[in-house]
């Protein structure tokens, strides 16, 4: 009796269990009572990453430099190309179809985590005792200058955006 289900890496067609094509190959013809499934390797710049019965291979992803993209890993007949972003840019999605410039942390904020090709800069507010007076994608919050260690006194208190201003001690005191 004709099968109703087939083994792994097989598919049912015309009451026959036919072998699927291996990754990197596409289906040319189904098996028959007298012949095997016929498969052909994917062409240049094409891939199929699963056991399949596809009659067309998928095109490798194009890493468009106009969108800030570059090739991180070249595709094979069994894998797609992996794109990443040029230096200073990061992907806008997991699929990495386009890039945006890394965010800078404004004055009063420092870099908690430097951006990568796939993640943006993470900023954090400078806590008490720290400051950042620049807009930067790399600079962390810096600690206020310690006037005491320089035998100086605080003349102007620091903020999250400014360092303390130190000055000489009052000699009259």
């Amino acid at each position: 009796e004709p099968p109703t289900a087939c083994r792994e890496k097989q598919y049912l067609i015309n009451s026959q269990c036919c072998s699927l094509c291996q990754p990197g190959q596409k289906l040319v013809s189904d098996c028959t009572e007298f012949t095997e499934t016929e498969c052909l390797p994917c062409g240049e710049s094409e891939f199929l990453d699963t056991w399949n019965r596809e009659t067309h291979c998928h095109q490798h992803k194009y890493c468009d430099p106009n969108l800030g993209l570059r090739v991180q890993q070249k595709g094979t007949s069994e894998t797609d190309t992996i794109c990443t972003c040029e230096e200073g840019w990061h992907c806008t999605s997991e699929a990495c179809e386009s890039c945006v410039l890394h965010r800078s942390c404004s004055p009063g904020f420092g870099v908690k985590q430097i951006a990568t090709g796939v993640s943006d800069t993470i900023c954090e507010p400078c806590p008490v005792g720290f400051f950042s007076n620049v807009s930067s994608a790399f600079e962390k919050c810096h600690p206020w200058t310690s006037c005491e260690t320089k035998d100086l006194v605080v003349q102007q208190a620091g903020t999250n955006k400014t360092d303390v201003v130190c000055g000489p001690q009052d000699r009259l005191r």
Epitope: S19, V28, S29, D30, T32, E33, F34, T35, E36
Partner: antibody, heavy 112, light 112 residues
């Protein structure tokens, strides 16, 4: 339903060429399957002669050396057998077949 | 070429009896994918061969379950569980694993 029908001359002179046509209905010969020519000699012995595949490629029985050619006309859904330099040894019933379906056969006698 | 040896050449049976036909190959018919393309055909008097069993044990559509095929490698058997008058004729095995395809010499099933 798939049907195959052979046609061609029933008598061929020695040293001449034997040409047969197989007309297929109910299935396109370009879709799938191997389209075979098989002959049956007096006394029932069957011999596979060769096939033309759905994609137009061929395979022949080496015993027929360079005498055999199988071609097709996809617009008419027909395939053809040509056997050159025939002798009386080529007298047989000739079948075209997809193997799960066969033509009714055509008898060919080689005689002067 | 693969040689298929069928036995017996003639098989006299009584209606209702079981009949078994053997087909032995000169080399294994299992291909690299683990498939074995050994087929059985019945040729009734005055007719073309008709497919009964493909790939050793699969009944072709419309074939009654009285017909069954078994075997592997080089040794194959066709069994008819209860012979009926319409089963009479010549049975052939055919291998299509290796080119050239080759047939067995045939077994004539007849009434005792």
């Amino acid at each position: 339903e798939v049907q195959l029908q052979e046609s061609g001359p029933g008598l061929v002179k020695p040293s001449q060429s034997l040409s047969l046509t197989c007309s297929v209905t109910g299935y396109s010969i370009t879709t799938n399957y191997y389209w075979n020519w098989i002959r049956q000699f007096p006394g029932n012995k069957l011999e596979w002669m060769g096939y033309i595949k759905y994609d137009g490629s061929n395979n022949y029985n080496p015993s027929l050396k360079n005498r055999i050619s199988i071609t097709r006309d996809t617009s008419k859904n027909q395939f053809f057998l040509k056997l050159n330099s025939v002798t009386t040894e080529d007298t047989a019933t000739y079948y075209c077949a997809r193997l799960d379906y066969w033509g009714q056969g055509t008898s060919v006698t080689v005689s002067s | 070429d693969i040689v298929l040896t069928q036995s017996p050449l003639s098989l006299p049976v009584s209606l209702g009896d079981q009949a078994s036909i053997s087909c032995r190959s000169s080399q294994s018919l299992e291909n690299s994918n683990g498939n074995t393309f050994l087929n059985w055909f019945l040729q009734k008097p005055g007719q073309s061969p008709q497919l009964l069993i493909y790939k050793v044990s699969n009944r072709f559509s419309g074939v009654l379950d009285r017909f069954s095929g078994t075997g592997s490698g080089t040794d194959f058997t066709l069994t008819i569980s209860r012979v009926e008058a319409e089963d009479l004729g010549v049975y052939f095995c055919l291998q299509v694993t290796h080119v050239p395809f080759t047939f067995g010499s045939g077994t004539k099933l007849e009434i005792k």
